[in-house]
């Protein structure tokens, strides 16, 4: 379809780099959540940092191209990296408007399918790009 994809846009304070230029930020009349209209893909993404007690959103926005996973209707995150011991980054890609606003579910830390606690470690910030 010719219409462009619109996604939720968010970047946590301290995250290095930005995906802001992958789309056009929209004025939706409310402070949050922000919306971004994708330029180069029809695909949204989300990254969450899962620790023992909570999941915290790190980034949400547009992908720079359509890739496997972008055909998903919903955000179903999968584990990608370990920014620090006891936390795991989960990412999703999906291809409907605002599909990255929230995830459908996250597996509990340490459950099957989550990389073991001895998995690859990354410096803060770097891990976001590993996840993308």
């Amino acid at each position: 379809p010719p219409n462009r994809r619109t996604c939720v846009f968010f970047e946590a304070p301290g995250v290095r780099g930005s995906t802001k230029t992958l789309g056009e930020l929209l004025d939706t009349g409310t402070e949050l959540p922000r919306a971004i209209r994708c330029l180069y893909s029809r695909c949204c993404f989300g990254i969450w940092n899962l620790t023992q007690d909570r999941a915290q959103v790190e980034m949400q926005g547009c992908r720079d191209s359509d890739e496997p996973g972008c055909e998903s209707l919903h955000c179903d995150p999968s584990p990608r990296a370990h920014p620090s011991p006891g936390s795991t980054l989960f990412t999703c890609s999906c291809g409907t408007d605002f599909c990255n606003a929230n995830y459908s579910h996250l597996p509990p830390p340490g459950s099957p399918g989550t990389p073991g606690s001895q998995g690859p470690q990354a410096a803060p910030g770097e891990s976001i790009w590993m996840a993308l």
């Epitope: 010719p2 219409n3 462009r4 619109t6 230029t21 056009e24 929209l26 004025d27 939706t28 009349g29 919306a35 209209r37 330029l39 180069y40 893909s41 720079d64 191209s65 359509d66």
Partner: antibody, heavy 117, light 111 residues
Framework: QVQLQESGPGLVKPSETLSLTCTVS?????????WNWIRQFPGKGLEWMGY???????SYNPSLKSRITISRDTSKNQFFLKLSSVTAADTAVYYC??????????WGQGTLVTVSS | EIVLTQSPGTLSLSPGERATLSCSAS??????????MHWYQQKPGQPPRLLIY???SLESGIPVRFSGSGSRTDFTLTISRLEPEDFAVYYC?????????FGGGTKVEIK
């Protein structure tokens, strides 16, 4: 200062392939934004042909999709247009332009391409 | 694709007068209330020059006598007081849907 410059043959024979180069200075084509080809027909109408983004993703005007190819050489900071099976209707001034988001903020001076035998 | 119709085709005015140019889209060019319509000026032998983006935002370096307004399908470019250098052809462009499309242009000529 961002500058774009088109180059290529000014005369192309019908049924052949039109090939143009856009050389960009003052900005890396891999840094950001998208790099477009736009043409202007003798009647002054403008047509967006397609782009290649900083990351290499490509989008074409559906009216040209079967004939157009846009590519790039990042080492030379150049991007290219190929348009196959040209006819007299492809005679136009061809511009390369940068799109900052979805509008065109920097343009080349344009090059006239005439399709004639 | 979205068709943009500009009117009038030619506008004959004198320096100092107000110019009002219209661009009508075959369907809405808004996304969640944001208008993806842009305006360019073109002089003979030159490429188009960006004046206004997203309906009403003035491009850096463009004089404040140029302004844009409108939403959904109807947009206007206004030149509050025509200067001699403003006599040119003006084009609208939409980017709400692929492919990007341009209007046919309005020529502003000296009366």
């Amino acid at each position: 200062q961002v500058q774009l410059q088109e180059s290529g043959p000014g005369l192309v024979k019908p049924s052949e392939t039109l090939s143009l180069t856009c050389t960009v200075s003052g900005y890396s084509i891999t840094s950001d934004y998208a790099w477009n080809w736009i043409r202007q027909f003798p009647g002054k109408g403008l047509e967006w042909m397609g782009y290649i983004s900083y990351s290499g993703s490509i989008s074409y005007n559906p009216s040209l999709k079967s004939r157009i190819t846009i590519s790039r050489d990042t080492s030379k900071n150049q991007f290219f247009l190929k348009l196959s099976s040209v006819t007299a209707a492809d005679t136009a001034v061809y511009y390369c332009a940068r799109s900052r988001y979805s509008w065109f903020d920097y343009w080349g001076q344009g090059t006239l391409v005439t399709v004639s035998s | 694709e979205i068709v943009l119709t500009q009117s009038p085709g030619t506008l004959s005015l004198s320096p100092g007068e107000r110019a009002t140019l219209s661009c009508s889209a075959s369907e809405s060019v808004d996304t969640y209330g944001n208008s993806f319509m842009h305006w360019y000026q073109q002089k003979p032998g030159q490429p188009p020059r960006l004046l206004i983006y997203r309906a009403s935002s003035l491009e850096s370096g463009i004089p404040v006598r140029f302004s844009g307004s409108g939403s959904r399908t109807d947009f206007t470019l206004t030149i509050s007081r025509l200067e001699p250098e403003d006599f040119a052809v003006y084009y609208c462009q939409q980017s709400n849907e692929d492919p990007y499309t341009f209007g046919g242009g309005t020529k502003v000529e000296i009366k």
